[in-house]
């Protein structure tokens, strides 16, 4: 339904608090380098303008699109060119090209300082002094570092952030109360950001059809009792929500997400028996809860799939009449029967089915041609099953840190041109699949592991896209969304790689390593491991293990020494010499 003033419509729907928060998120995701107070000022100006439009929808400029209003506001920033360079050229464009231009300049790895957590007392004082500004700063800092963070979900995180400070700043032991909650929010936030980044990549790089296929498979697993028409309606609405958020239309996205949650709860009887608790919660919690809800039980006595999709003589007729609808029904029927499969596997099966029908429906005897199509699925199903079994065994044998190291070596040998920080970050995250998924029973392992790996490999893809250095990464990232993981798994050692020159500075360590947290210390060691492999890509596992064991002993010894810095200098030289000898450098 058309509104005279879009900005007034969204202000009224969302309320002032959510409106301001979402505009702040939008602005911080576009202009990631601007200081906090500049954004606050711009948001306040937009909010005041929105209020005039609520009072009189016919007032000047109230009929303008949100992109026009927001874009005009962003283009008033005086230092646009000196801070953002060519992004300033966006302001010479008209909508919708201007917004597309801003979107293209979003930076997945902005050059921003690491967020350092102040002392608990300092945070509590700041929270009590100015709660509203404290929470705005949280939204701003997360949004600018995660320019595709799912905005309505970030409001949910902010609500939990506020609740943590409200509770813990009154506690006897503030730190014991607050720090675990902040750690949990940080870890969940990173995971949420990465999951949303994959959704946006899916929409932006592979199109709406790819996203809809993903959504059909996932929602059919989650809501196996729902009819195909119901799932299709949910998929259409969900696609609209994510298209809006990924496109920077955060007010529309949040509004439509609230409408979708309302619809789901009003129709839960025909969707899922697992929604009752979610639907009793307030809006932000409700939407989050629905997004994370467990799979409903499969209906009893579902007929064999073969009847409709292989044995029926109408397969080609039904396919020809409405290809995407028929393939959607196949995906729905297969997914609701297989909560034990990853979404990407289900999509590979659907693609195989589609390719077979394309070929066979043009053949002399279509039925004869596609009669054995389900046999083609067997190796596709077994490949991830075997891979997960092998890797979970390795994880259980090694533990998380050493499992990460094994993956670091594996991926550095596959794509040694990728920057060391990216290889460390991605391999560490790949390694987390062990503790995240291997504890699950067989029936839950594959959806947990392979769909998580899709999220992590997408991080590699978006970081690599910013500074492409490897044709192999580009190939795996761009050829097929659902085959990214098999593509990376299939990569062998890059024989064309010319080993990096040895640089002793890379392997020089100082006493500051002793004061680092265990995680930071691991990252230092893993960085050194990647550099070792880049110097000596043909090094064996045994050689690398020996060097890493020596390195760990060296750090431990020098951190216990009285004169730590001297120890690091002297013992470090010996270690480098011994490592070079061991690896034949």
């Amino acid at each position: 339904d058309a509104h005279k003033s879009e900005v007034a419509h969204r202000f009224k729907d969302l309320g002032e608090e959510n409106f301001k928060a979402l505009v702040l998120i939008a602005f911080a995701q576009y202009l990631q380098q601007c200081p906090f107070e500049d954004h606050v000022k711009l948001v306040n100006e937009v909010t005041e303008f929105a209020k005039t439009c609520v009072a009189d929808e016919s007032a000047e400029n109230c009929d303008k699109s949100l992109h026009t209003l927001f874009g005009d506001k962003l283009c008033t920033v005086a230092t646009l060119r000196e801070t953002y360079g060519e992004m300033a050229d966006c302001c010479a464009k008209q909508e919708p090209e201007r917004n597309e231009c801003f979107l293209q300049h979003k930076d997945d790895n902005p050059n921003l300082p690491r967020l350092v957590r102040p002392e608990v007392d300092v945070m509590c004082t700041a929270f009590h002094d100015n709660e509203e500004t404290f929470l705005k700063k949280y939204l701003y800092e997360i949004a600018r570092r995660h320019p595709y963070f799912y905005a309505p979900e970030l409001l949910f995180f902010a609500k939990r952030y506020k609740a943590a400070f409200t509770e813990c700043c009154q506690a006897a032991d503030k730190a014991a109360c607050l720090l675990p909650k902040l750690d949990e929010l940080r870890d969940e936030g990173k995971a949420s950001s990465a999951k949303q980044r994959l959704k946006c990549a899916s929409l932006q790089k592979f199109g709406e059809r790819a996203f809809k296929a993903w959504a059909v498979a996932r929602l059919s697993q989650r809501f196996p009792k729902a009819e195909f028409a119901e799932v299709s309606k949910l998929v259409t609405d969900l696609t609209k929500v994510h298209t809006e958020c990924c496109h920077g239309d955060l007010l529309e996205c949040a509004d439509d997400r609230a409408d979708l949650a309302k619809y789901i709860c009003e129709n839960q009887d025909s969707i899922s028996s697992k929604l009752k608790e979610c639907c009793e919660k307030p809006l932000l919690e409700k939407s989050h809860c629905i997004a994370e809800v467990e799979n409903d039980e499969m209906p009893a006595d579902l007929p064999s799939l073969a009847a409709d999709f292989v044995e029926s003589k109408d397969v080609c007729k039904n396919y020809a009449e409405a290809k995407d609808v028929f393939l959607g029904m196949f995906l729905y029927e297969y997914a609701r029967r297989h909560p034990d499969y990853s979404v990407v596997l289900l999509l590979r099966l659907a693609k195989t089915y589609e390719t077979t029908l394309e070929k066979c429906c043009a053949a002399a005897d279509p039925h004869e041609c596609y009669a054995k199509v389900f046999d083609e699925f067997k190796p596709l199903v077994e490949e991830p099953q075997n891979l997960i079994k092998q890797n979970c065994e390795l994880f259980e044998q090694l533990g998380e840190y050493k499992f990460q190291n094994a993956l670091l070596v594996r991926y550095t040998k596959k794509v040694p041109q990728v920057s060391t920080p990216t290889l460390v970050e991605v391999s560490r995250n790949l390694g987390k699949v062990g503790s995240k998924c291997c504890k699950h029973p067989e029936a839950k392992r594959m959806p947990c592991a392979e769909d998580y790996l899709s999220v992590v490999l997408n991080q590699l893809c978006v970081l690599h896209e910013k500074t492409p250095v490897s044709d192999r990464v580009t190939k795996c990232c761009t050829e097929s969304l659902v085959n990214r993981r098999p593509c990376f798994s299939a990569l062998e050692v890059d024989e064309t790689y010319v080993p990096k020159e040895f640089n002793a500075e890379t392997f020089t360590f100082h006493a500051d390593i002793c004061t680092l947290s265990e995680k930071e210390r691991q990252i230092k060691k893993q960085t050194a491991l990647v550099e070792l492999v880049k110097h000596k890509p043909k090094a064996t596992k045994e050689q690398l293990k020996a060097v890493m064991d020596d390195f760990a002993a060296f750090v431990e010894k020098c951190c216990k020494a009285d004169d730590k810095e001297t120890c690091f200098a002297e013992e470090g030289k010996k270690l480098v010499a011994a490592s070079q000898a061991a690896l034949g450098l």
């Epitope: 200081p35 107070e37 002094d129 100015n130």
Partner: nanobody
Framework: EVQLVESGGGLVQPGGSLRLSCVAA????????IGWFRQAPGKEREGVSC???????YYADSVKGRFTISRDMAKKMVYLQMNSLKPEDTAVYYC?????????????????WGQGTQVTVSS
Amino acid sequence: EVQLVESGGGLVQPGGSLRLSCVAAGFTLDYYAIGWFRQAPGKEREGVSCITSDGRTYYADSVKGRFTISRDMAKKMVYLQMNSLKPEDTAVYYCAAGACMGGSGYEADFGSWGQGTQVTVSS
């Protein structure tokens, strides 16, 4: 409540130096830019220098190379070191909290003001 108090003004000879201080009470410098403004007799108030919450600095052309803005987050202090002072720098200097918006300061971008401190450059 946001409160700003300036100090450090006085009488100085041309070519001399002064260091103005601004203490910020009731808020944290993490959330605001602090700007220094001045108003000479019979003239409009003008932006002199500005420092953002993340430490970026801006200066009016007339003071570039002579004035330096800095801050001490722990003490909630912002300083304006003024060197090579000229008679035309004579004015009441105010500090204010708000947003630099990428410049040395526009009054409209600042919501909270101090009372001001007099700087006189004369031989």
